[in-house]
């Protein structure tokens, strides 16, 4: 039960990419405000986004403390202008979120091809190691720092003149592939965490093609 004229939040949803993590919910408030609390399974509740009229709350700062922990959030509803008011049970109306484990569930952001370099019939393609908001010793960690060898990249590459996509995989951020001399190739990469059962793949990077400024060609 809750305070008169307040409704409980619903459709609590975690939106997370490369550990940037926002809790969203409904409905848009009418004469009410929300406060969010977050905790690990064994920890204490911490309040965030106090008395907000938003229907989202950025919880990144909390979850990056330990991305392998499982988190639970709850959204409290209060009457606008009377936030001390409680329901008949002596506490405000609230709704729990689904559990969320960032390491297992954060979406992999769209990767970027940093560079490619052709030397004869070999091309070295480098994927940008994206910075996350996870910190260690006051330094922001990269995606590779966080996931280590759990993270792989799939490279799709194809001759500009054909449609069939060859693939290569790496558990670093670099590919070394064989190409036909005199042919222009295009490239796209995808981040993958094979050990996951959900959110295994990122969206594809923008396509980069030889003959464009990102690449470098050296005839040996």
């Amino acid at each position: 039960s809750g305070t008169t004229n307040t409704v409980a939040a619903y459709n609590l949803t975690w939106k997370s990419t490369n550990f940037k993590t926002i809790l969203e919910w409904e409905p848009k408030p009418v004469n009410q405000v929300y406060t969010v609390q977050i905790s690990t399974k064994s920890g204490d509740w911490k309040s965030k986004c106090f008395y907000t009229t938003d229907t989202e709350c950025d919880l990144t700062d909390e979850i990056v403390k330990d991305v392998k922990q499982t988190y639970l959030a709850r959204v409290f509803s209060y009457p606008a202008g009377n936030v001390e008011s409680t329901g008949s049970a002596g506490e405000p109306l609230y709704e729990n979120s689904p559990e969320f484990t960032p390491y297992l569930e954060t979406n992999l952001g769209q990767p970027t091809i940093q560079s490619f370099e052709q030397v004869g019939t070999k091309v070295n393609v480098t994927v940008e190691d994206e910075r996350t908001l996870v910190r260690r010793n006051n330094t922001f960690l990269s995606l590779r720092d966080v996931f280590g060898k759990d993270l792989i990249y799939t490279l799709y590459y194809w001759k500009s003149s054909s449609s069939g996509k060859k693939t290569a995989k790496t558990n670093t951020n670099e590919f070394l592939i064989d190409v036909d001399k005199g042919e222009n190739y295009c490239f796209s990469v995808q981040a993958v965490i094979p050990s996951r059962t959900v959110n295994r793949k990122s969206t594809d990077s923008p396509v980069e093609c030889m003959g464009q400024e990102k690449g470098e060609f050296r005839e040996i």
Epitope: I152, T154, S163, G164, K165, P194
Partner: antibody, heavy 120, light 107 residues
């Protein structure tokens, strides 16, 4: 439980067409890659092609290029192999298989296969 | 395309025998080689991945090794259920390619 079930095989005349289906359960195909592999009677395994259902990217063996098309419907969790201009040498059991997607593990689950016979 | 040359094409062995099957890649494939077992009328089953790693649920009598571009599947003590055809496959480059297969028969 991960399962792949092929269907759609049968007898077809040379020059004809056939569409095979590969229905997946126990996993979401968009998170993986699906390959088709065939085996002519009494012969070895021959890779046919793959699809990444997440983006529709495909690649085909030279022997089927231009005649076969792999597609996927992620809403049905099913991959397809459209075979056109069929020849006698396409007679085989056709398997779909799941590509785990890591640097190490490759085709970890296979369907039971469906027989395609091309004959007049 | 990379060729995988498998030998022998067939062999006869008895229960308890140590059996070795080899596969040679026509160029470097790193460790991107898998071994599959296939029984008549059935789909292939993954045995070994990444040249030497035993796939989940596969008996420990199966093992794999690599020496340069040569790959070996060993069955330390052949069991009745091991009589089947074995295939190697490289997945280092597209297209992935299979060896011709080795049929292990009862002596």
């Amino acid at each position: 439980e991960v399962q792949l079930v092929e269907s759609g095989g049968g007898l077809v005349q040379p020059g004809g067409s056939l569409r095979l289906s590969c229905a997946a359960s126990g996993f979401t195909i968009s998170g993986y890659w699906i390959h088709w592999v065939r085996q002519a009677p009494g012969k070895g395994l021959e890779w046919v092609g793959y699809i990444d259902p997440a983006n529709g990217f495909t690649y085909y063996a030279d022997s089927v290029k231009g005649r076969f098309t792999i597609s996927a419907d992620t809403s049905k969790n099913t991959a397809y192999l459209q075979m056109n201009s069929l020849r006698a040498e396409d007679t085989a059991v056709y398997y779909c298989a799941r590509d785990y997607g890591s640097v190490r593990v490759f085709l970890d689950y296979w369907g039971q296969g469906t027989l395609v016979t091309v004959s007049s | 395309d990379i060729q995988m040359t498998q030998s022998p094409s067939s062999l006869s062995a008895s229960v308890g025998d140590r059996v070795t099957i080899t596969c040679r890649a026509s160029q470097d494939v790193n460790t991107a080689v898998a071994w599959y077992q296939q029984k008549p009328g059935k789909a292939p089953k993954l045995l070994i991945y990444s040249a030497s790693f035993l796939y989940s649920g596969v008996p420990s009598r199966f093992s794999g090794s690599r020496s340069g571009t040569d790959f070996t599947l060993t069955i330390s003590s052949l069991q009745p259920e091991d009589f089947a055809t074995y295939y190697c496959q490289q997945h280092y480059t597209t297209p992935p390619t299979f060896g011709q297969g080795t049929k292990v028969e009862i002596k």
